[in-house]
């Protein structure tokens, strides 16, 4: 028996369902009573879901997995993982035994988009050219860790005096806080871009200082 899985990682958004595809080619006359199908975590071999001795033996993994029972006889051994969590990320092995056996691993990459950044300034009043100002760009509930880029109004990258921190919450999602310290010119626009490297999703925030008062561009 030959087991086939997708070579590319499966990317799943947090709280959505994911299908880990796995298939085999049944011989003529194949019956489910002959099938041993086991999904397990590749690294630890912890059982995830199994179908053996003609029976679906259920989810051993947070009760969030299911097979496609009507498709098994056609060689579809795919696993449905419901309500994906950050902790589900990793490699899963599909093990199929009929007379002989084969196995293959599929990777699950979990992702969550970052929120539109909110921008704050300190100090936020009585600003004059030459003042040192701290601009904070905050974006929430993303996964995996973000890449953060700052630019000025001319699109020139700002790399000095940037401090970025990323903290995971209890669900494993990251809140990003990036702080830029700059000396104000007469006018200035400062943009922050928070990129999710898996989703290739960019979230933008900016603040414009035009003398007095400060203005924030309207939300897109």
């Amino acid at each position: 028996v030959e087991v086939q899985v997708s070579e590319d990682p499966v990317v799943a958004l947090v709280d959505t369902d994911a299908t880990l595809r796995c298939s085999f080619s049944p011989e003529p006359g194949f019956s489910l009573a002959q099938l041993n199908l086991i999904w397990q975590l590749t690294d630890t071999k912890q059982l995830v879901h199994s179908f053996t001795e003609g029976r679906d033996q259920g989810s051993a993994y947070s009760n969030r997995t299911a097979l496609f029972p009507d498709l098994l006889v056609q060689g579809n051994a795919s696993l449905r993982l419901q309500r994906v969590r950050v902790t589900d990320e990793g490699s899963y092995t599909c093990f199929v035994s009929i007379q002989d056996f084969d196995s293959a691993a599929v990777s699950l990459q979990v992702a969550a988009p970052y929120s539109k950044p909110s921008m704050t300034l300190e100090p936020n009043k009585d600003l004059r050219p030459g003042n040192m100002v701290t601009i904070t760009c905050s974006s929430y509930q993303g996964y995996p860790e973000a890449e953060v880029f700052w630019k000025d109004g001319q699109g020139v990258p700002l790399t000095g005096n940037v401090t970025t921190s990323q903290m995971a919450n209890e669900r494993g999602l990251f809140d990003v806080h990036s702080v830029l310290r700059v000396v104000l010119g007469a006018n200035g626009t400062y943009s922050c871009l928070v990129r999710n490297p898996v989703l290739q999703q960019d979230a933008h925030g900016s603040v414009t200082i035009t003398g007095q008062p400060l203005t924030f561009p309207p939300e897109a």
């Epitope: 041993n36 086991i38 397990q40 071999k45 912890q46 059982l47 053996t52 001795e53 093990f95 056996f101």
Partner: antibody
Framework: QVQLVQSGAEVVKPGASVKVSCKAS????????MHWVKQAPGQGLEWIGM????????NYNERFKTRVTITVDKSTSTAYMELSSLRSEDTAVYYC??????????WGQGTLLTVSS | DIQLTQSPSFLSASVGDRVTITCSAS?????MYWYQQKPGKSPKLLIY???NLASGVPSRFSGSGSGTEYTLTISSLQPEDFATYYC?????????FGQGTKLEIK
């Protein structure tokens, strides 16, 4: 015919570890789940965990997860259950049992483990 | 975990009696399995998939039920039937057993 023959009785001290064996014969060892079940003196049956010899997949009861390791040696058709950090409450008969569909259809004769100082 | 509660826990009966043991599950299960255990012996599978007799088990044993309520019936007790009986489920992990029903001679 299916036979599961377990290792003999053990007397061990608290804090130690023990490894019980279960030698299978009369069937294709790699095709069936092997379970381990605990029965304390005068008590009922408690599932410890299981392993599939072919893939090595295992699943443990959360109550035992931190102290139990179930393994197999395919070359000798033998399953093992190792229990660590033993305490008096671990005194019990331990059974290996082969799956039959969703049941445990064939059982070993049991291994009495006594934890005593 | 799915809890299985057997009733009664103890049962006194005479040879020839019809006895019924009930197993109630805390959540719905697909199938129930029944075992017999005699003192100093390993458990023996009696009934699989709720109602199917395991190989070599006399036809006086029968099982029925669905959802959360299952029963084991012995139609006419024989002397060799006095033992402890356990129900078990594998619809959900961990696998669980009932606490047992001890069947004694009256």
């Amino acid at each position: 015919q299916v036979q599961l023959v377990q290792s003999g009785a053990e007397v061990v001290k608290p804090g130690a570890s023990v490894k019980v064996s279960c030698k299978a014969s009369g069937y294709t060892f790699t095709n069936y789940w092997m379970h381990w079940v605990k029965q304390a003196p005068g008590q009922g049956l408690e599932w410890i965990g299981m392993i599939h010899p072919n893939s090595g997949a295992f699943n443990y009861n959360e109550r035992f997860k931190t102290r139990v390791t179930i393994t197999v040696d395919k070359s000798t058709s033998t399953a093992y259950m190792e229990l660590s950090s033993l305490r008096s409450e671990d005194t019990a008969v331990y059974y290996c049992a082969r799956s039959t569909a969703l049941a445990t259809g064939y059982w070993g004769q049991g291994t009495l483990l006594t934890v005593s100082s | 975990d799915i809890q299985l509660t057997q009733s009664p826990s103890f049962l006194s009966a005479s040879v020839g009696d019809r006895v019924t043991i009930t197993c109630s599950a805390s959540s719905s299960v697909s199938y129930m399995y029944w075992y017999q255990q005699k003192p100093g012996k390993s458990p023996k599978l009696l009934i699989y998939d709720t109602s199917n007799l395991a190989s070599g088990v006399p036809s006086r044993f029968s099982g029925s039920g669905s959802g959360t309520e299952y029963t084991l019936t012995i139609s006419s007790l024989q002397p060799e039937d006095f033992a402890t009986y356990y129900c078990q489920q594998w619809s959900s992990y961990p696998l669980t057993f009932g606490q047992g029903t001890k069947l004694e001679i009256k």
